[in-house]
Interface confidence: low
Amino acid sequence: GELETSDVVTVVLGQDAKLPCFYRGDSGEQVGQVAWARVDAGEGAQELALLHSKYGLHVSPAYEGRVEQPPPPRNPLDGSVLLRNAVQADEGEYECRVSTFPAGSFQARLRLRVLVPPLPSLNPGPALEEGQGLTLAASCTAEGSPAPSVTWDTEVKGTTSSRSFKHSRSAAVTSEFHLVPSRSMNGQPLTCVVSHPGLLQDQRITHILHVSFLAEASVRGLEDQNLWHIGREGAMLKCLSEGQPPPSYNWTRLDGPLPSGVRVDGDTLGFPPLTTEHSGIYVCHVSNEFSSRDSQVTVDVLDPQEDSGKQVDLVSAS
């Protein structure tokens, strides 16, 4: 006869490991007992359990409560055992020795491999600001046995670098994602993907990018200067900018205080019916936590009577 077993048994941390050992004998042969031992190189054999055809299972004190026979129905030629709740320290070489009648003794070895799935963590880098050079966006670390694979899934252009630290029974892998921040990256997902044989599917942690910026400011409302004449109602200036965080707006007049009746409403400066007093240089100040910008315009309120007088003069001069 011969023993049937596996070269390698792979189990995930915390699961039960079935250590197979089946005697395939000739008709009439019997198994008297099966002894299981741990036999790591350089260390003496450590008994796990003894499976006796007559007296049942005896588990050594070191493995009390952790070694069981597989559930029934059981074949008398099957010497397999279950090692409950596998831990990393269980990883190693195991041997089953089978005593048979009348064929004698047989032995076989297997290797137990305990997979330790990683628990990944993602840490965002420093605050991202437009205008920075290559900057750390996020780092992702996963430790497991064997070493996990850490990659990035994103549409954002960037560079990755990885490093690995080996521990006695596991390895930690850290991958960093660097990018040159730009405003177009705002809201884009950056996903750390961790693969490992102990995981049913890849683990993914997503970080949403946030890039601080402040666009140049400009003022709208003066496109047609002829509309800015004495008596006009509803005249307004609007300050245009864009930023993250959203900016706040402030209006001042460069050549004196804001005239009475002028309303500041965030990005908009509203005028009462225009008079020549409203002529001047107006400045829009835009700021957020990242930066500040200014834009200034000159308002020249026209006097229609004055203009028509000038026109008459020009006509008469010709």
């Epitope: 993602l122 405003r183 177009s184 705002n186 809201g187 884009q188 997503t206 946030h210 993250q244």
Partner: antibody, heavy 117, light 106 residues
Framework: QVQLQESGPGLVKPSETLSLTCTVS????????VHWVRQPPGKGLEWIGV???????NYNPSLKSRVTISRDTSKNQVSLKLSSVTAADTAVYYC???????????WGQGTLVTVSS | DIQMTQSPSSLSASVGDTVTITCRAS??????LAWYQQKQGKAPKLLVY???NLADGVPSRFSGSGSGTDFTLKINSLQPEDFATYYC????????FGGGTKVEIK
């Protein structure tokens, strides 16, 4: 003011594909994500997935094998397809908008989809 | 996935009371937490984002606090329009919501 409006059939047969459309009006979707969130009757909220302004998508791992989110930028519409539906997929389906993070500042009013033969 | 445990699942209070709702994450989510209010038959409404920031137009009687794993939504001087269900939601990776807290009239 940004507004989101879900539309689609209110009744879907088991094993068929649920299809919904979210129409966004009153604002640009640049730098934003449009998400789908569902709520079974009398129960809590479950995030389904998102499509970002760049076109990339992220899905809830528990639904990933059955979900597709796509968009038609010319119509400012985002669509959700959920295949092989069962009664457990009966829910109010919301579309919602987010900025740089996965929190939702604007929501549609929701549409009830019942899975029944 | 990160689990969000919200408590209590329901509470009774009177107008003018101060109400506190807590939310616990199964792992560190830093400040990546939002709070929503949902009224019967309506869509949720964002109240607080990034754990402590009030969303636009939300009355100052609402406040959020906490970071890491433990978070709190506090409503000072409860108003009639505040009777609703409140949900926390993390946005650290795949978003998940808490089970909800129903605030009812005592």
């Amino acid at each position: 003011q940004v507004q989101l409006q879900e539309s689609g059939p209110g009744l879907v047969k088991p094993s068929e594909t649920l299809s919904l459309t979210c129409t966004v009006s009153g604002g640009s979707l640049t730098n934003y994500g449009v998400h789908w969130v569902r709520q079974p009757p009398g129960k809590g909220l479950e995030w389904i997935g998102v499509i970002w302004s760049g076109g990339s998508t992220n899905y809830n791992p528990s639904l990933k094998s059955r979900v597709t989110i796509s968009r038609d930028t010319s119509k400012n519409q985002v669509s959700l397809k959920l295949s092989s539906v069962t009664a457990a997929d009966t829910a109010v389906y919301y579309c919602a908008r987010s900025g740089k993070w996965y929190y939702f500042d604007y929501w549609g009013q929701g549409t009830l989809v019942t899975v029944s033969s | 996935d990160i689990q969000m445990t919200q408590s209590p699942s329901s509470l009774s209070a009177s107008v003018g009371d101060t109400v506190t709702i807590t939310c616990r994450a199964s792992q560190n989510i830093y400040s990546n937490l939002a709070w929503y209010q949902q009224k019967q038959g309506k869509a949720p409404k964002l109240l607080v984002y990034a754990a402590t920031n009030l969303a636009d137009g939300v009355p100052s009687r609402f406040s959020g606090s906490g970071s890491g794993t433990d978070f709190t939504l506090k409503i000072n001087s409860l108003q009639p329009e505040d009777f609703a269900t409140y949900y926390c939601q993390h946005f650290w990776g795949t978003p998940t919501f808490g089970g909800g807290t129903k605030v009812e009239i005592k």
